[in-house]
Amino acid sequence: HAPEDPSDLLQHVKFQSSNFENILTWDSGPEGTPDTVYSIEYKTYGERDWVAKKGCQRITRKSCNLTVETGNLTELYYARVTAVSAGGRSATKMTDRFSSLQHTTLKPPDVTCISKVRSIQMIVHPTPTPIRAGDGHRLTLEDIFHDLFYHLELQVNRTYQMHLGGKQREYEFFGLTPDTEFLGTIMICVPTWAKESAPYMCRVKTLPDRTWT
């Protein structure tokens, strides 16, 4: 039977999405116990029927990976969790409408920072996602967001930073002092979706200038 308040058993049902990996998470309520079991369903906007997620029925953990089930970038999804306590009490709660394009956050890019004598090179590696194209290959963030660009910053000292940016994958900061440490930060930006990744940071030291020895 339904509890007096569904929040007694179940709270904070939501999608947590990063780089299009879409995980449903929730918390137990104050009357939830370790033997409370959870069953997950999902559906798309405007559809009547909820689909039970295989592998997430009568589970005790508080998360369920719905990446595959929510992989259409243009679709709106919902998920809902039904909690059943050992005593037979139940509660159901659903997420807000979920759009992976809108709601996914961006992880820091994967970057290789290469030290040279008077420059530092930064090579950004394409970020794979779980999203698959029609032919089955995995799309990168660049494939999905056509206006994606990279913002790079090199902290030279407390008051001076150098900036580079663009869509290309290779960058180089020139005119640096040899044998000096610099802090580089690289972010992914997607203006149309107002997205900005957390920064990748690399602390690198230019090589010593051996030409004078």
Epitope: V13, K14, T44, T74, Y78, R80
Partner: antibody, heavy 116, light 113 residues
Framework: EVQLVESGGGLVQPGGSLRLSCAAS????????MNWVRQAPGKGLEWIGE????????TYNQKFKGRATLSVDQSKNTAYLQMNSLRAEDTAVYYC?????????WGQGTLVTVSS | DIVMTQSPDSLAVSLGERATINCKSS????????????LAWYQQKPGQPPKLLIY???SRESGVPDRFSGSGSGTDFTLTISSLQAEDVAVYYC?????????FGQGTKVEIK
């Protein structure tokens, strides 16, 4: 069987407020979205807004934003519509209706008359 | 806001004859994710709330007689009652759920001739 029952309608003075209730039975309110729609006498249907009872997230028709507030009491399985600064043209039957896109279950409606 | 315009405002049809109601939207209601149209039809009888008849432009709600059918795509939609019955006398509304705010047509009153 799913049932929605509105209450709280009646005569209200211009400038006054009202709080309408929509008691859901036959299902858990938190298992679907709830909408409010109104219909002035002899007129068409007008969507006021929706609420996700699980999260409290609301979306309003801009026409009513600032005057309408949707809320729920999960423990009572009941949704609410609060309307402020009422005027004569707010006289209507107010319905709650379930679902997230189109509306599969409707209450019988409650009549609100705004008049001095 | 998407404007929904129904025609005619009212029509009188003989029992057993076909009734056709049109609904036009001010922008396309085609939902790219599933290539369906975000349009619903309702029937409202005096003193009652609306009753869902059709959703996704052509899917009939459970329990609705098969004389009711919906068709159309993009911006032009039709509700057809293939053989009008006395109990079909009502006002019919279309509704779009493509974008907020959800909007309804002004209604079409169907009467017996």
């Amino acid at each position: 069987e799913v049932q929605l029952v509105e209450s709280g309608g009646g005569l209200v003075q211009p400038g006054g407020s009202l709080r309408l209730s929509c008691a859901a039975s036959g299902y858990s309110l938190t298992a679907d979205y709830m909408n409010w729609v109104r219909q002035a006498p002899g007129k068409g249907l007008e969507w006021i807004g929706e609420i996700n009872p699980s999260t409290g997230t609301t979306t309003y028709n801009q026409k009513f934003k600032g005057r309408a507030t949707l809320s729920v009491d999960q423990s009572k399985n009941t949704a609410y519509l609060q309307m402020n600064s009422l005027r004569a043209e707010d006289t209507a039957v107010y319905y709650c209706a379930r679902f997230d896109a189109y509306f599969d279950y409707w209450g019988q409606g409650t009549l609100v008359t705004v008049s001095s | 806001d998407i404007v929904m315009t129904q025609s005619p405002d009212s029509l009188a049809v003989s029992l057993g004859e076909r009734a056709t109601i049109n609904c036009k939207s001010s922008q396309s209601l085609l939902y790219s994710s599933n290539q369906k149209n975000t349009l619903a039809w309702y029937q409202q009888k005096p003193g009652q709330p609306p009753k869902l008849l059709i959703y996704w432009a052509s899917s009939r709600e459970s329990g609705v007689p098969d004389r009711f059918s919906g068709s159309g795509s993009g911006t032009d939609f039709t509700l057809t009652i293939s053989s009008l019955q006395a109990e079909d006398v009502a006002v019919y509304y279309c509704q779009q759920y493509f974008s907020y705010p959800f909007t309804f047509g002004q209604g079409t009153k169907v009467e017996i001739k």
